[in-house]
């Protein structure tokens, strides 16, 4: 509440997060032309990346393009990319949608379609839909521990969200345990009125807001955090503005003295921890 | 504009960026003592790294030290590092400029020069100039989509820079399209009065400022972003303070049961997205 | 100092850090059942990661689990995890503490103990203490250069912490050189009243606060930074809340047609650079 007689100061904040959980992933894997059931376990080192404190990422889905090598190949025949003769292909042209640079030749992509040949990481990435349901949909049951240290330098006051009296096996609940700082990812989505299973397919950005409204006067001292949750990406976004949340990264290796890579398009939830508030003192 | 009757509140912001573009890189590659022209394609997975939302990095240049292995070798003969006898080399000494720990011996670096032997990743990195022109100078034509979600919690107001009416094939222009949030990297530099081709060699830091001056009163509601650009690193910086922007990272692998690494010194542009502003309401 | 007649504006900040130093690491390495003393050199590419500007991480300790592969194995026999018959093991169960999914069988872990068999990255990570003393304890002597560019957009004023007159071979000292922006990591800890050698074992978070109290009136202009240091993680934290600072990451590779990984549990210091302050002008 606004106490006009107080000197207000914005919060200086530092955040540390720790995600826990394992996911069981079952998918069809094709090797040497044979498709069989692949089953694997993903732990924190597989699905999360060492990001900064005020943000963490959990991979919930992916598409892999294995064994790519720098060479020439037909580009992916997405809408409007097919050709019937070399006239349609322009040497040196880089289509922003494409993944390579055209050589000027029109070549067969498969038995029925021809596309412009490109110099690229080949075979080029297929523009296929993200798997549905999401491969790591069980990430809904992962938990995250959030540690938040705050400071009001002008008032020379420091505190943190985790108190010595807290129980490390708690789970946050808006009513039953609003001070617990261990959050189940599915609960965060439920609190924000979102469907984890749905968002996990394309990815998204979820905000965890930590609000500190601190009264630092000794006679009515109060300084505890209040947690709230809201989705930050636009779920109604037009296709051209890249809905969801994904990024590509590569694992490089050498085989028969040729550099190759596996390209991973990782979809997932980026959680942004937004800390705000003020400390007021007479 | 300052409306003194309004209750002002600072903006809470979340940013998501997406870089697009491919670069064609031509460089001299030495294999087995033979130097030939190498040609390769770099896409987003090759030149950018999954960073936080409020910052993204585009590699524009690099120097590689391939096949390094942990052993003993002469250190690089930079200015003041040469020796004529063991007396000049101190066992256990770590020169901050060097990349290893001295053994105490003075050994031949090449036919004409001797340097102190070090325990290090060998052969040690050559302190050569960044290639000029920059290898990925065509990054000037890459584009970045910036999505910015903002919140004024006290006023319970949320909005974003991308509106449903916007066109996903636009490109930002200060006059013709100041609300488009797809930016050509070269244009950002031009707006900031900087030369992309020049900065790409050594790297640098570019600020993209998003200013929200929001009047949230219903009778004169206005809340749209204003974009501006300024260079954040000091182009006149003394050599000793490490001008430009670069960092080193390594790719590790095993060969004949020996751990090896390729060291990459990556030069590039770090773009910092600085969101600020206030929301005022009666 | 508070000049009530001035229009105050919060600082907009961008930070760039550069860590320097090499560490000599000696540890016991087991290969083919034979344990021998391993000696290696770590440079910036080995112990630090390309993070955002306002944070950087220095690895000071680690535990490696080499050659893990997705298969079945007995889980680690931590407290309460042992079994005597299959009844104790529940098919499909994922214990949050465990690293895999139970098959329902109770199998020998070693000659004396049995644990539940899991589908996981095997052999599962041993829950052993972080090495003491820390493997990269010499990181105490590393230095970090901090470049900070600040902006008061409302006052159209920009400056930086590094001035042209500064000497690139300086080291920060509270009394003798309080404007030098090259900091020895050990000095940062000493200033904060902390023991680097101790914190290096489990890791921690250290805050570097940069306070800009700027008077932008021409007749009494002053705008220089003041540096201070404080530990941000809770050293008295209960075990259940994960004391220190560590994260796991993996290096993946293929051998004998099986995907393998080396899991690294990296302990270290995350340095958060917290920039705050105001610019006032009549």
């Amino acid at each position: 509440s606004d106490k006009l007689y107080q000197r207000k100061e914005p919060v200086i904040s530092s955040v540390h997060t720790k995600v826990k959980g394992i996911a069981e992933v079952t998918e069809n894997v094709t090797e040497g032309g044979v498709t069989k059931l692949g089953h694997s376990i993903f732990d924190t080192a597989d699905y999360t990346f060492p990001l900064q404190g005020n943000s963490f990422f959990v991979m919930t889905n992916y598409v892999k393009s294995e064994g790519q090598v720098q060479t020439l190949c037909p580009e992916y025949p997405r809408r409007g990319a097919q050709c019937s003769s070399d006239r349609r292909c322009k040497k040196g042209w880089m289509d922003p949608q494409s993944k390579g640079i055209q050589t000027g030749r029109c070549v067969p992509y498969d038995k029925t379609r021809k596309t412009c040949e490109v110099s690229a990481w080949c075979p080029t990435e297929e523009e296929k839909e993200a798997p549905r349901p999401a491969l790591l949909r069980s990430a809904e049951n992962f938990t995250v521990l959030i540690k938040n240290n705050i400071h009001f330098p002008g008032h020379n006051y420091t505190t943190r969200n985790i108190l010595p009296t807290m129980n490390g096996s708690c789970t946050f609940h808006k009513t039953w345990d609003p001070q617990c700082s261990i959050f189940r990812l599915g609960d965060i989505f439920q609190e924000a009125g979102e469907n984890f299973t749905e968002v996990a397919v394309q990815g998204g950005i979820m905000g965890i807001e930590i609000y500190w409204d601190c009264n630092l006067d000794s006679w009515s001292h109060h300084c505890r955090p209040r947690y709230s949750f809201r989705r930050l990406d636009d779920k109604n976004m037009d296709e051209s503005f890249v809905p969801g949340y994904n990024f590509r990264y590569a694992k490089y290796y050498k085989e028969n003295n040729v550099e190759k890579r596996t390209l991973i398009k990782a979809f997932g939830i980026r959680f942004d921890i937004l800390v705000f508030g003020t400390g007021g003192k007479f | 504009s300052d409306k003194l009757y309004q209750r002002k509140e600072p903006v809470i912001s979340s940013v998501h960026t997406k870089v697009k573009g491919i670069a064609e890189v031509t460089e001299n590659v030495t294999e087995g003592g033979v130097t030939k022209l190498g040609h390769s394609i770099f896409d987003t997975a090759d030149y950018t790294f999954p960073l936080q939302g409020n910052s993204f990095f585009v590699m524009t240049n690099y120097v590689k030290s391939e096949g390094q292995v942990q052993t003993l070798c002469p250190e690089y003969p930079r200015r003041g590092a040469q020796c004529s006898s063991d007396r000049r080399c101190k066992k256990g000494w770590m020169d901050p400029q060097s990349k290893g720990i001295q053994t105490g011996r003075c050994v031949p670096y090449d036919k004409t020069r001797k340097t102190c032997e070090v325990s290090a990743w060998c052969p040690t990195e050559e302190e050569k100039e960044a290639p000029r022109p920059a290898l990925l100078r065509s990054a000037e034509n890459f584009t970045v989509l910036i999505k910015n979600n903002i919140h004024f919690p006290g006023h319970n107001y949320t909005t974003r820079n991308i509106l449903p009416t916007m066109n996903g094939s636009c490109t930002f222009h200060k006059t013709w399209d100041p609300q488009c949030s797809i930016f050509r990297l070269g244009d950002i530099f031009q707006e900031a009065g900087e030369n992309f081709t020049e900065v790409a060699v050594q790297g640098g830091i570019m600020g993209i400022e998003i200013y929200w001056d929001c009047n949230l009163d219903s009778w004169s509601h206005h809340c749209r972003p204003r974009y501006s650009f300024r260079r954040l690193d000091d182009k006149n910086m003394d050599e000793s303070f490490v001008p430009g922007y670069n960092f080193r990272y390594a790719k590790y692998y095993k060969e004949n049961n020996v751990e090896k690494r390729t060291l990459i010194k990556a030069f590039g542009i770090r773009f910092d997205i600085l969101v600020f502003g206030t929301g005022g309401k009666f | 100092s508070d000049k009530l007649y001035q229009r105050k504006e919060p600082v907009i900040s961008s930070v760039h850090t550069k860590v320097k130093g090499i560490a000599e690491v000696t540890e016991n390495v087991t290969e083919g059942g034979v344990t021998k003393l391993g000696h290696s050199i770590f440079d910036t590419a080995d112990y630090t990661f390309p993070l955002q500007g306002n944070s950087f991480f220095v690895m000071t300790n680690y535990v490696k689990s080499e050659g893990q592969v997705q298969t079945l194995c007995p889980e680690y026999p931590r407290r309460g995890a042992q079994c005597s018959s299959d009844r104790r093991c529940k098919k499909g169960w994922m214990d949050p503490q465990s690293k895999g999914i139970q098959t329902g069988r109770c199998v020998p872990y070693d000659k004396t103990r049995k644990t539940c068999e899991v589908s996981a990255w095997c052999p599962t990570e041993e829950e052993k203490e972080a090495p003491r003393p820390a493997l990269l304890r010499s990181a105490e002597n590393f230095t970090v250069l901090i470049k900070n560019n600040i902006h008061f957009p409302g006052h159209n004023y920009t400056t930086r912490n590094i001035l042209p007159t500064m000497n690139g071979s300086c080291t920060f000292h509270k009394t003798w050189d309080p404007q030098c922006s090259i900091f020895r990591l050990g000095d940062i800890f000493q200033e904060a009243g902390e023991n680097f050698t101790e914190v290096a074992v489990q890791g921690g978070i250290m805050g570097i606060e940069i306070y800009w109290d700027c008077n932008l009136d021409s007749w009494s202009h002053h705008c220089r930074p003041r540096y201070s240091f404080r530990r941000l993680d809770d050293k008295n934290m209960d075990e259940s809340f994960v004391p220190g600072y560590n994260f796991r990451y993996a290096k993946y590779y293929k051998e004998n047609n099986v995907e393998k990984r080396t899991l690294i549990k990296a302990f270290g210091i995350r340095f958060d650079i917290l920039v705050f302050g105001t610019g006032g002008k009549f």
């Epitope: - | - | 298969t71 052999p123 099986v258």
Partner: nanobody
């Protein structure tokens, strides 16, 4: 039906070499640990060597340095290269494997055994 089929046994002189192989066939999800055991007449079956899917190996003291276990994960086959054979190595050698028929459905399988005789 899953089967383990051994081959490569036979009669060899002391100091000689043999290479045993054992292939898993049938329909299954994954072959995990594989091993070789042996049983000499009138004695209990004992472990000779085992190998994990990640190629970690373990040997009985009596064969360490003479025998080498290896596997081929494409062919789902385990090998035992036996050098410097001694008369006391004479036994029936059994192949063993933990095989997942489906996900989280492990079963232990044994081969029918192959005779190795070391004699001059």
């Amino acid at each position: 039906e899953v089967q383990l089929v051994e081959s490569g046994g036979g009669l060899v002189q002391p100091g000689g070499s043999l290479r045993l192989s054992c292939a898993a066939s049938g329909s299954f999800f994954r072959v995990n640990n594989m091993a070789w055991y042996r049983q000499a007449p009138g004695k209990q079956r004992e472990l000779v060597a085992d190998i994990t899917r990640g190629d970690r190996t373990n040997y009985a003291d009596s064969v360490n340095g003479r025998f080498t276990i290896s596997r081929d994960n494409v062919r789902n086959t385990v090998y035992l290269q036996m050098n410097g054979l001694k008369p006391e190595d004479t036994a029936v050698y059994y192949c063993y494997a933990t095989i997942e028929l489906g996900v989280l459905e492990p079963r232990d399988y044994w081969g029918q055994g192959t005779q190795v005789t070391v004699s001059s």
